[in-house]
Interface confidence: medium
């Protein structure tokens, strides 16, 4: 009797695990074995697929085969007893495109009101994801063990901290990876549970803010208790998007180590231009608080949200105001990649009645003024970006007299 070729071959690839499954064509024939060959693109000859020769079951693993995962591969299978079936050819495929992302590894650390999540790809030194290991983003589902009400958090990176949790409470979570460059969504990790610790005696500092004074940055925060010391650390924010572990190290700000006030002042040249994360910790000598929530600190926005510089051209019934970029030390205008909106306040010198104009443009007309009258003007800049809500302080007031009548042109 002629052996029939096996049918319905499925290729399952999860991380670096290559599994083949197929259906027997004839269940009535016993002691049948199955063998696979493979062929790479541009090759004419077929090669025996190691790990998938003379298989008695309907599943085999060819993970040991060293393949270029970005190259197309073709497979064929046949049944063997005394004689052999004809070959059944499987549609060609590219392993990388077919691969699914396996469950990530998850390690949890508990604080009193926060959980730190360390996530790494499930397969260490994966061949499949060798070019993508640092491009993974993750999403998670977290719930209180007692309630089961789920909260989803999308687009997190390999280190993530969830704040505003309850002390001494068990939280459970599961995590899956995604590779957005390839539009791949992985499978969830097993569920991990952890209990938050007893409430710490010292809460973390809150409401951290950065401002610029002269050539210094001033970092301020709120704290519940007096007679404390504080330390501040920074991290380059670039590491959040692609966190290479060897560089993911928080560093001290030298002028903000063991400060006894709820603020510290450090020179602007401590930081190169860039975006950083800052965090603050409190200590009373015996105990330390957990770290505060991280704040984002952007040197460029701090620098250029100095008050705007402007010139006034006076007419009889209006002012034309020309806004320029503020100057940094060295008198060079700040590079302005952020969109700004300008708030202009003006008033008659003899009156307290202020009028306001909000304008995107850098040339603004202040209308309906009286001739030969002194008006004062001050301005400030705001970012228009939804992700950064910052405002400069007002510029110093500049006072000008309008021209005599009929010079409005």
């Amino acid at each position: 009797k002629n052996l029939k070729s096996p049918q319905k071959v499925e290729v399952d690839i999860i991380d670096d695990n290559f599994i083949l499954r197929w259906n027997r064509s004839d269940e009535s024939v016993g002691n049948v074995t199955f063998s696979f060959d493979y062929q790479k693109t541009g090759m004419d000859n077929w090669i025996k697929l190691s790990g998938c020769q003379n298989i008695t079951s309907t599943k085999c693993n060819f993970s040991s085969l060293k393949l270029n995962v970005y190259e197309e591969i073709k497979l064929r299978i046949r049944a063997e007893k005394e004689n052999t079936s004809s070959w059944y050819e499987v549609d060609s495929f590219t392993p990388f495109r077919k691969a699914q992302i396996g469950p990530p590894e998850v390690h949890l650390e508990a604080e009193d009101k926060a959980i730190v999540i360390h996530i790494s790809p499930g397969t260490k030194d994966s061949v499949m994801w060798a070019l993508d290991g640092l491009s993974f983003t993750y999403s998670l589902v977290i719930w209180k063990n007692s309630s089961g009400v789920e909260e989803r958090i999308e687009n997190i990176y390999s280190r993530h901290k969830i704040y505003k949790l309850s002390p001494e409470t068990t939280y459970c979570l599961k995590v899956k990876a995604a590779l957005l460059t390839s539009w791949k969504i992985g499978v969830y990790s097993p569920v991990h549970c952890i209990k938050t610790t007893v409430e710490n005696e010292l809460p973390p500092p809150e409401n951290i803010e950065v401002s610029v004074q002269n050539q210094n940055y001033v970092l301020k925060w709120d704290y519940t208790y007096a007679n404390m010391t504080f330390q501040v650390q920074w991290l380059h924010a670039f590491l959040k998007r692609n966190p290479g572990n060897h560089l993911y190290k928080w560093k001290q700000i030298p002028d903000c180590e063991n400060v006894k006030t709820t603020q510290c002042v450090f020179p602007q040249n401590v930081f190169q231009k860039g975006i950083y994360l800052l965090r603050v910790q409190a200590s009373d000598g015996n105990n330390t608080s957990f770290w505060s929530e991280e704040i984002k600190f952007d040197t460029e926005i701090q620098a250029f949200l100095l008050p705007p510089v402007f010139n006034i051209r006076s007419l009889s019934d209006s002012f034309h105001i020309y806004i320029g970029a503020p100057k940094q030390s060295g008198n060079t205008p700040v590079i302005q990649d952020y969109p700004l909106i300008y708030e202009i306040i003006f008033w008659e010198n003899t009156s307290n009645a202020e009028r306001k104009i909000i304008e995107k443009k850098t040339d603004v007309t202040v209308p309906n003024l009286k001739p030969l009258t002194v008006y004062c003007v001050k301005a400030r800049a705001h970012t228009m970006d939804e992700k950064l809500n910052k405002s400069s302080v007002f510029s110093d007031a500049v006072c000008e007299k309008t021209k005599p009548g009929n010079t409005s042109k």
Epitope: L131, L134, N155, Y157, L180, T181, H236, A237, F238, L239, K240, R241, N242, P243, G244, L247, Q272, K273, G274, I275, L277, K296, D298, E300, I301, I335, D337, Y338, P339, D385, E386, K387, L388
Partner: antibody, heavy 123, light 106 residues
Framework: QIQLVQSGPELKKPGETVKISCKAS????????VNWMKQAPGKGLKWMGW????????TYADDFKGRFAFSLETSASTAYLQINNLKNEDTATYFC????????????????WGQGTLVTVSA | DIVMTQSQKFISTSVGDRVSVTCKAS??????VAWYQQKPGQSPKTLIY???YRYNGVPDRFTGSGSGTDFTLTISNVQSEDLAEYFC????????FGGGTKLEIK
């Protein structure tokens, strides 16, 4: 002012390797990612991937995995694109571009572009 | 992948006219869309980012609008120097570009 200056045009044979440079000036090199784009003759722009100039980690778009490699010479504020085992279909102009102000974890528009490097692959 | 579709391959217009270039995203990209102008033999130049913010030095005849999946670049009072190809790009998740729309001046 901010500039990205790319190396000159290249004429290569199939199977050879090409390495294009992109020299940045006017800003702190390690604060902004460098992205690479391909534009085949008469075609649109295709994003090839980016390199994190702070960590040196590259990210490749699907169609550019395998033969393509991004690298850095941070001390010279220069990013490189290397293409191995060149094929005829690699004939294109390659652009490097710097992101605008980025927000960590997010992506930003491409604010500054190199002038482009034409790579011609022909037997 | 997020696909950006510019259905108009060419638009023919006259100096002084108002013209709209459209771009459709295959899924919601919020306002993370930029527009670039590319003249023959040159690199692309940023015109608009975050859907509607004009980039530094870009004339105010260029405006951007839209959100979610539908985006428009409008050029009012078209000038002869606007003859170029215009590309949209999403940066909500990595980067993808539209196929481009060539503006021809009659």
């Amino acid at each position: 002012q901010i500039q990205l200056v790319q190396s000159g045009p290249e004429l290569k044979k199939p199977g050879e390797t090409v390495k294009i440079s992109c020299k940045a000036s006017g800003y702190t090199f390690t604060n902004y990612g460098v992205n690479w784009m391909k534009q085949a003759p008469g075609k649109g722009l295709k994003w090839m991937g980016w390199i994190n100039t702070y960590t040196g980690e590259p990210t490749y778009a699907d169609d550019f995995k395998g033969r393509f490699a991004f690298s850095l010479e941070t001390s010279a504020s220069t990013a490189y694109l290397q293409i191995n085992n060149l094929k005829n279909e690699d004939t294109a102009t390659y652009f490097c571009a710097r992101e605008g102000v980025y927000y960590y974890g997010d992506w930003a528009w491409l604010a500054y572009w190199g002038q482009g490097t034409l790579v011609t692959v022909s037997a | 992948d997020i696909v950006m579709t510019q259905s108009q391959k060419f638009i023919s217009t006259s100096v002084g006219d108002r013209v709209s270039v459209t771009c459709k995203a295959s899924q919601n990209v919020g306002t993370n869309v930029a527009w670039y102008q590319q003249k023959p033999g040159q690199s692309p130049k940023t015109l608009i980012y975050s859907t509607s913010y004009r980039y530094n030095g870009v004339p105010d005849r260029f405006t951007g609008s839209g959100s979610g999946t539908d985006f428009t670049l409008t050029i009012s009072n078209v000038q002869s120097e606007d003859l170029a190809e215009y590309f949209c790009q999403q940066y909500n998740s990595y980067y993808t570009f539209g196929g481009g729309t060539k503006l021809e001046i009659k």
